[in-house]
């Protein structure tokens, strides 16, 4: 069961896995949640009654019964991991800790104007886990305004001490705020021979890459496939690092694959969620339970529902045995990965889906699209919303995209003449406008946030956020789309679609069924040639066919230009403006969302 509240002056007895240092009980709970085995924790706050060497200790604990005896202890704060909860979880920690020095390896020291600048430096440095900044009131003159970037093997401090006039905090890489590049390629027949920080077993290079991404010290990896000549090293995933942050040694070797941590774009890819099944593959590990199950899918469900289960192997039933039920082996290990992977024994293996909630909802696979045709089907574009105005009469005003459970991203120009958010209604999960009746449920708008540099669509900054009055419960027909990563600026998107209920030609009417059109992106240089009278800035992105014929049009404004990349849909553009609709050599112009990620996060993550 999910217990979120913290238990003051309470200590859990026994079950210790390991001790780390965290600046707060709240962060200790996050560390416990992300640890492969931790179910409970006890944190020791600073207190005159406690030995200072025990301040800020976070003891991670496990228990077969999922609970432990409670003991009263002043300054102890205990609680449960969020593994047992169904809500979305994030490792993002923007808190700044005053008068705390978080100890680690100080590998970089420089002058910074503020703690915020120091935190940004940490976020954009590949090695940095956390920082300590000496403020201008720091007693030692030569250390004032010094920003120390730090790292450790675990990503958490090795100790935390009280120190006046310093502040400390964590890298914001896990908040999607890093400008570091995101190298998504996996290099076949390549070994990176740099330092290994850890090794785990993985069924394929993709899982190896995801493990690297959420391992605090891993910058790149090498994976030995099941065809690797050395049997003892098959399925071995080597997690690696180097001083420069890049591999210094690339060696050609067949049956090996190498790649990079996707830390700086992890909010738009699944990192914890290994949803595939591995056929004719057995995962070895500590056995938790053996239960009968009808299929490998049922076995995965059983593993997901058992909080301590990390992975499983299903052995299908021998004909007519046990009512057609096979055996489902629920397993765990110290690091969440199989201790060995065997092939050719007929098992079907996979991982718990319990950790999927640690990934952004937007990375969830949606139903396969219908190829061809222009009318969409239900659930094809679950982030698309229709924004209605009720004044003077109710009508479709603009499109928009769900980007969070209380947030819609749309175009600023949609709100020309809109005096109050009270007249707006957001409908999600809609395919046909005719579905919208008086009693159809909608989301009221609490606030319209228009970019403060917006003047008119053609001059850019055509972007706005709607904060909803209530939260969206995600389902197959309404769920968010991922924002592009800042580290993905150089990605060339080839599978882009514009959707909306807008006109199908310049003089037309709003369409009943949500329309879709696949449209190629056009370079900004090419786009500028087509719009000599306008300035096409890097904050705009263009899409269209040279010959015209397919485009967004009136009523599509604010809606998404959605591009699929590595199986995940990204909101690359917001429909903004164009000369006419679908005219020859007149591409549509869209707000280039990647250039506004900081603005979006600043507005949506504001406390």
């Amino acid at each position: 069961e999910c217990v979120t509240q913290l238990l003051k002056d309470t200590c859990f007895e026994g079950g210790d896995i390991t001790t780390v240092f965290t600046p707060s009980a709240k962060y200790c709970q996050v560390v416990c949640t992300y640890h492969p085995r931790c179910l409970l924790f006890t944190f020791t706050a600073e207190s005159p009654s406690e030995d200072p060497t025990r301040w800020f200790t976070c003891v991670l604990k496990d228990s077969v019964t999922e609970t432990l005896p409670r003991v009263n202890r002043t300054a102890a704060i205990s609680g449960y991991s969020f593994k047992q909860c169904s809500h979305q979880i994030s490792a993002c920690n923007k808190d700044i800790y005053v008068d705390l020095d978080m100890k680690g390896i100080n590998y970089n020291s420089s002058v910074a104007k503020s703690a915020q600048e120091c935190q940004e430096r940490c976020t954009d440095d590949v090695h940095c886990h956390f920082f300590t900044y000496a403020t201008r009131q720091f007693p030692s003159l030569e250390h004032r305004n010094i920003c120390l970037l730090k790292h450790t093997q675990t990503g958490t401090p090795t100790r935390i001490t009280k120190l006046d006039k310093v502040v400390s905090g964590f890298s914001l890489k896990s908040c999607a705020l890093s400008n570091l590049a995101c190298i998504r390629d996996i290099f076949p027949n390549t070994v990176f021979a740099d330092s290994n920080i850890d090794s785990v077993m993985a069924p394929d290079a993709f899982v190896c890459g995801r493990i690297c991404t959420h391992h605090p010290g891993c910058l790149f990896f090498t994976f030995f496939s099941q065809e690797w000549p050395k049997e003892s090293q098959r399925n071995l995933c080597l997690l690696k690092t180097s001083e420069s942050g890049l591999p210094s040694t690339r060696i050609k070797k067949s049956k090996a694959l190498s790649g990079f941590s996707l830390q700086s774009c992890r909010h738009s890819i699944p990192v914890f969620c290994h949803s595939s099944f591995y056929h004719d593959t057995d995962f070895l590990g500590e056995e938790l339970d053996i239960v009968a199950a009808k299929s490998h899918e049922a076995c995965q469900k059983l593993c997901t529902n058992a909080v301590r289960c990390q992975f499983f192997t299903y052995t299908p039933a021998q004909a007519s045995c046990n009512e057609g039920k096979g055996k489902c082996y629920l397993k765990l290990s110290s690091n969440g990965s199989p201790t060995k992977i065997l092939h050719g024994r007929g098992g079907i293996s996979g991982y718990t889906l319990r950790l999927c909630k640690m990934d952004n909802e937007c990375t969830t696979k949606i139903k396969p699209r219908i190829v061809g045709g222009t009318a969409s089907v239900r659930g094809e574009w679950p982030w698309q919303v229709t924004l209605h105005t009720t004044s003077p009469t109710q009508r479709h005003l603009c499109g928009g995209s769900i980007i969070g459970n209380q947030w819609i991203l749309t175009a600023a120009h949609c709100f020309y003449g809109v005096e109050s958010p009270k007249i707006l209604r957001v409908y999600s999960g809609i395919l046909n406008q005719s579905e919208i009746k008086e009693d159809t449920s909608f989301f009221g708008v609490q606030e319209i946030i228009i970019h403060d540099q917006y003047k008119m669509a053609e001059s850019g900054y055509d972007i706005a956020l709607l904060k909803l009055e209530t939260t969206v419960n995600y389902t197959d027909s309404q769920r968010p789309i991922c924002l592009p990563s800042k580290g993905d600026r150089n990605v060339i998107y080839t599978d882009c679609w514009v959707t909306g209920w807008g006109y199908r030609k310049l003089r037309d009417k709003i369409q009943n069924t949500l329309q879709k059109a696949k449209i190629p992106l056009v370079t900004n240089e090419e786009c500028q040639k087509r719009y000599r009278g306008h300035k096409i800035t890097h904050k705009m992105i263009c899409a269209g066919y040279r010959e015209g014929g397919k485009d967004a049009c009136k009523g599509d404004s604010g809606g998404p230009l959605s591009c699929k990349h590595n199986e995940v849909w990204h909101l690359v553009g917001i429909t903004s403006w164009g000369e006419g609709c679908a005219q020859r050599e007149r591409p549509g112009v869209y707000t280039n969302v990647v250039e506004y990620v900081d603005w979006i996060l600043e507005k949506t993550q504001a406390v």
Partner: nanobody
Framework: QVQLVESGGGSVQAGGSLRLSCTAS????????MAWYRQAPGNECELVST???????YYADSVKGRFTISRDNSKNTLYLQMNSLKPEDTAVYYC????????????????????WGQGTLVTVSS
């Protein structure tokens, strides 16, 4: 039990040469990717050169053109011919089998299926 035994280390003047050997036993040498690593006092373990089972070679930039790696599968032996030695080549040299990168900067800890020798000291004086 797998054994890798290095020999040929010693003291030499800058500009001189040495040839290191590594004799392997208890595993199929010709199927293994072999390497030389080195660790200078206070420094991390660094890869010097690799020779794969099919004969492909790799050299660290700092030794390119001066060191040559080779293997004799019939003798289960790996070699490192070191010419034009410099004082900065001073280190303990380790022979390794199927070891792609050191672990935590140390030339002794391995992952499954990877093996290290005990090391041989090379001292280059100016």
């Amino acid at each position: 039990q797998v054994q890798l035994v290095e020999s040929g280390g010693g003291s030499v003047q800058a500009g001189g040469s040495l040839r290191l050997s590594c004799t392997a036993s208890e595993f199929t040498f010709d199927d293994s990717d072999m390497a030389w690593y080195r660790q200078a006092p206070g420094n991390e373990c660094e890869l010097v050169s690799t020779i794969t089972s099919d004969g492909g070679t790799y050299y660290a930039d700092s030794v390119k053109g001066r060191f040559t790696i080779s293997r004799d599968n019939s003798k289960n032996t790996l070699y490192l011919q070191m010419n034009s030695l410099k004082p900065e080549d001073t280190a303990v040299y380790y022979c390794a089998a199927d070891q792609w990168g050191s672990a935590e900067g140390d030339c002794t800890s391995s992952y499954p299926g990877g093996y290290w020798g005990q090391g041989t000291l090379v001292t280059v004086s100016s």
